[in-house]
Interface confidence: medium
């Protein structure tokens, strides 16, 4: 028997520095977790203790903090090189700055193979990107061979900016021939490493003949065997065992997100490459693990540029940006309109001639808007200003909801109106009218939504049975502020870009902004 240790991360999302327990900015260092310096300490400790170790990343290193905003992926290549990752799969967020924003900072600079078998380049891009990412890589580990085959969510064109010269194929269809090719090369230990979410990971384990282990990402799935060490609730045991169609037991793993845990899986193979046993658990990277001083020093060196960036002007406002609680928790506020407009603008994807865009709607809990911005400071807007407005380090995500769920959400928005509670929704691509004289749960008297399958966008009444795409904060997608109906009834959820980054990019693009209060939210006469 031959034993392999797989160390794995996924959905790190730019958390190069240690974070608080909820993966936001570290405040009390003695209670902070994760970060590349701490990860390196643990990885090296395991490399020293065990003979056959692979360090793998299942995608979405890009996007999530000011680190990515400023360094645009150069930080990912630099620190993944320093940690000596063995391979990485492309995630959807790796395309957030377009293909060029992937090629230059990461693909050309990484000293480890970057993989995806189901992304096919065409046209002029094919020669430009040739060899910079691979469908698979055979790695020497000790005296054995391990094949790593990559995959990426086929939804990426709707979630990011891969352009028109990359085709995202069905994962299973694309993986099978690559695995077959590895078998012909006498590679009998094969890991599928990819970024399509836990459901697809399980399908790959079930359907792709010859895959021995699946290491996934995208769905931020936390798996654990035994008593979990922090706040995350396990979605199943680690590893999650899938019985393949040809009767093999295939371990499937994921390691939550944000670099909070290091996935640790031990696999035992027989001489024919069959998995005999698999066991392990994610390792919580808490403060009991010291940060490596060399990596930490490097982090501090790179940090200097971030501090300078946060005070630079992104753009100007010529109007007061009203992000006050008195406004945003009670009525339409222009800060809410600005943020929602930025959220929609960030999700412009012309992927189908029948649609002007794939999504037109935004909802945003008023309680998530934490500060106004005064235009009387020469109109200047900085990252620092926006961090005061959106201090929680969340993301603006894409969900699919039925009209009936949206109606419930808007009823919840005003079910206890008047108490300055955070659930009052700011909107984009939606016209809502409330009648507060009616009883809670029946206060939405009009709800019109902007069409997407149209050449000239216009507002149509919401249809209860239709499925709609909506951009919203991850906080709402996870049922925050009492929006349990969203969490329980959403049909699809894909995590998006860092909230501040979305707004800052929009402001930089517009240069001068002047959002108005324009009648997106109305109250029927006599009720307000």
């Amino acid at each position: 028997a031959w034993e392999l240790t797989i160390l794995h991360t996924n959905d790190v999302h730019s958390r190069l520095e240690q974070t608080s327990e909820d993966s936001s900015k570290c405040v009390n260092a003695s209670r902070c977790m994760g970060g590349v310096a701490r990860l390196f300490t643990k990885v090296q400790q395991i490399r020293r203790a065990e003979p056959n170790v692979l360090l793998l990343d299942a995608g979405d290193q890009y996007q999530g903090t000011i680190w990515f905003t400023v360094y645009k992926g150069a930080e990912v290549a630099h620190f993944m090189n320093a940690l000596r990752y063995d391979a990485m799969a492309l995630g959807n967020h790796e395309f957030d700055n377009g293909v060029e924003g992937l090629i230059e900072p990461l693909l050309k600079e990484a000293k480890f193979p970057i993989l995806s078998a189901n992304i096919k380049a065409k046209g002029p891009l094919a020669s430009q990107i040739s060899g910079l990412y691979l469908p698979y890589k055979v790695l020497p580990v000790g005296d054995e061979v391990v094949g790593i085959v990559g995959y990426t969510s086929k939804e990426t064109p709707f979630l990011s900016n891969p352009g028109t010269n990359l085709v995202f194929e069905d994962e299973i269809t694309a993986l099978q021939p690559e695995v077959d090719k590895l078998k012909t090369l006498n590679v009998n230990k094969i890991i599928a490493l990819g970024h399509s979410g836990f459901e697809m990971d399980k399908l790959i384990a079930q359907k792709v003949r010859g895959v021995d282990v699946v290491v996934g990402g995208h769905s931020n799935t936390f798996l654990y065997t035994g008593n979990p060490p922090s706040k995350e609730v396990p979605a199943g045991k680690y590893p999650f065992i899938v019985t393949s169609d040809d009767g093999r037991k295939v371990p499937v793993v994921q390691a939550y997100a944000f670099g909070k845990y290091l996935g640790y899986l031990k696999i035992e193979f027989d001489e024919r490459g069959n998995v005999i046993s698999s066991h392990g658990n994610p390792i919580l990277l808490n403060s009991s693990i010291p940060e490596d001083p060399s990596i930490k020093a490097d982090i501090n060196k790179w940090r200097i540029k971030l501090d300078n960036y946060s005070t630079q002007e992104l753009g100007k406002t010529i109007v007061y940006l009203d992000g006050s609680s008195q406004s945003c928790r009670f009525r339409e506020c222009n800060m809410g309109n600005l943020i929602c407009d930025a959220m929609i603008n960030n999700n412009l994807r012309h992927t189908d001639e029948m649609f002007w865009n794939h999504v037109s709607m935004c909802i945003l809990n008023g309680g998530g808007i934490r500060s106004p911005i005064d235009e009387r400071n020469n109109g200047t807007i900085t990252w620092e200003n926006l961090a005061a407005v959106l201090p929680f380090g969340g993301t603006f995500d894409l969900v699919q909801l039925k009209g009936s769920t949206l109606k419930k959400a808007f009823e919840h928005s005003v079910h206890r109106y008047g108490q300055s509670t955070g659930e009052f929704l700011q909107v984009g691509g939606i016209h809502v009218v409330y009648d507060l004289s009616r009883k809670p749960g029946d206060r939405v008297v009009k709800l019109d939504v902007l069409c997407t399958k149209c050449r000239v966008p216009s507002y149509d009444p919401l249809k209860m049975d239709e499925v709609y795409k909506v951009i919203l904060p991850n906080f709402l997608a996870n049922g925050g502020d009492g929006f349990q109906m969203i969490k329980d009834e959403l049909l699809r959820h894909d995590s998006g870009d860092q909230d501040i980054n979305v707004v800052s990019t929009y402001i930089s693009k517009m240069k001068v902004i002047y959002p108005a209060v324009e009648g997106r939210i109305k109250f029927s006469t006599g009720s307000h």
Epitope: F40, Q44, N81, A82, R84, K111, F112, V145, S294, D298
Partner: antibody
Framework: QVQLVQSGAEVKKPGASVKLSCKAS????????INWVRQATGQGLEWIGW????????KYNEKFKGRATLTVDTSISTAYMELSSLRSEDTAVYYC??????????????WGQGTTVTVSS | DIQMTQSPSSLSASVGDRVTITCRAS??????LAWYQQKPGKAPKLLLY???TLASGVPSRFSGSGSGTDYTLTISSLQPEDFATYYC?????????FGGGTELEIK
């Protein structure tokens, strides 16, 4: 430009130890492995081991384990190789070489000029 | 340990000749193979890696091929500066061994 500069020639007696240095410049020292390779006169090349300067992680050729010790001083971007219990067959030119990549593309892309070690009684 | 056997051990050729040097590994090294050129009194110089990728600044007359256990270095048209000793090296399982070398001399 990127270069590795090695210390001068050494003459040692059998049983003694020798410590060779390799000073790097023109690149980030902590980002690349430093390997050591030797070549006896008129002979081929023999790999001794490598060290990752960022944290001193080492890997040795079993043949040299226990006799060769690889270390670094990152403050002066210098790698060292100490070889103990010298015998006459250790007489050779010793090279340090930078290794590119990790498990991606592997090769020695930059070499030092070599240090001649002579072991003689 | 994987042994690397180079052939021939020495070779005489003329300027303009096409020359082929082979390297056989005792086990599959999966293209993790580099070729170096060494001149007397000098350190080796990288020519190719991954069996066939030309290193930066190396003339295109040098090329590599092969897979599994058998690899070849070809010089399409010998130039005066190409007379030297050539070594292959595998980067599979440690120790990373070198071939015995091929001395290329002027005929």
């Amino acid at each position: 430009q990127v270069q590795l500069v090695q210390s001068g020639a050494e003459v040692k007696k059998p049983g003694a130890s020798v410590k060779l240095s390799c000073k790097a410049s023109g690149y980030t020292f902590t980002s690349y492995d430093i390997n050591w390779v030797r070549q006896a006169t008129g002979q081929g090349l023999e790999w001794i081991g490598w060290i990752y300067p960022r944290d001193g992680f080492t890997k040795y050729n079993e043949k040299f384990k226990g006799r060769a010790t690889l270390t670094v001083d990152t403050s002066i971007s210098t790698a060292y190789m100490e070889l103990s219990s010298l015998r006459s067959e250790d007489t050779a030119v010793y090279y340090c070489a930078r290794k590119e990549g990790y498990r991606g593309d592997w090769y020695f892309d930059v070499w030092g000029q070599g240090t001649t070690v002579t072991v003689s009684s | 340990d994987i042994q690397m056997t180079q052939s021939p051990s020495s070779l005489s050729a003329s300027v303009g000749d096409r020359v082929t040097i082979t390297c056989r590994a005792s086990g599959n090294v999966h293209n993790y193979l580099a070729w170096y050129q060494q001149k007397p009194g000098k350190a080796p110089k990288l020519l190719l890696y991954n069996a066939k990728t030309l290193a930066s600044g190396v003339p295109s007359r040098f090329s590599g091929s092969g897979s599994g256990t058998d690899y070849t270095l070809t010089i399409s048209s010998l130039q005066p500066e190409d007379f030297a000793t050539y070594y292959c090296q595998h980067f599979w399982s440690t120790p990373w061994t070198f071939g015995g070398g091929t001395e290329l001399e002027i005929k």
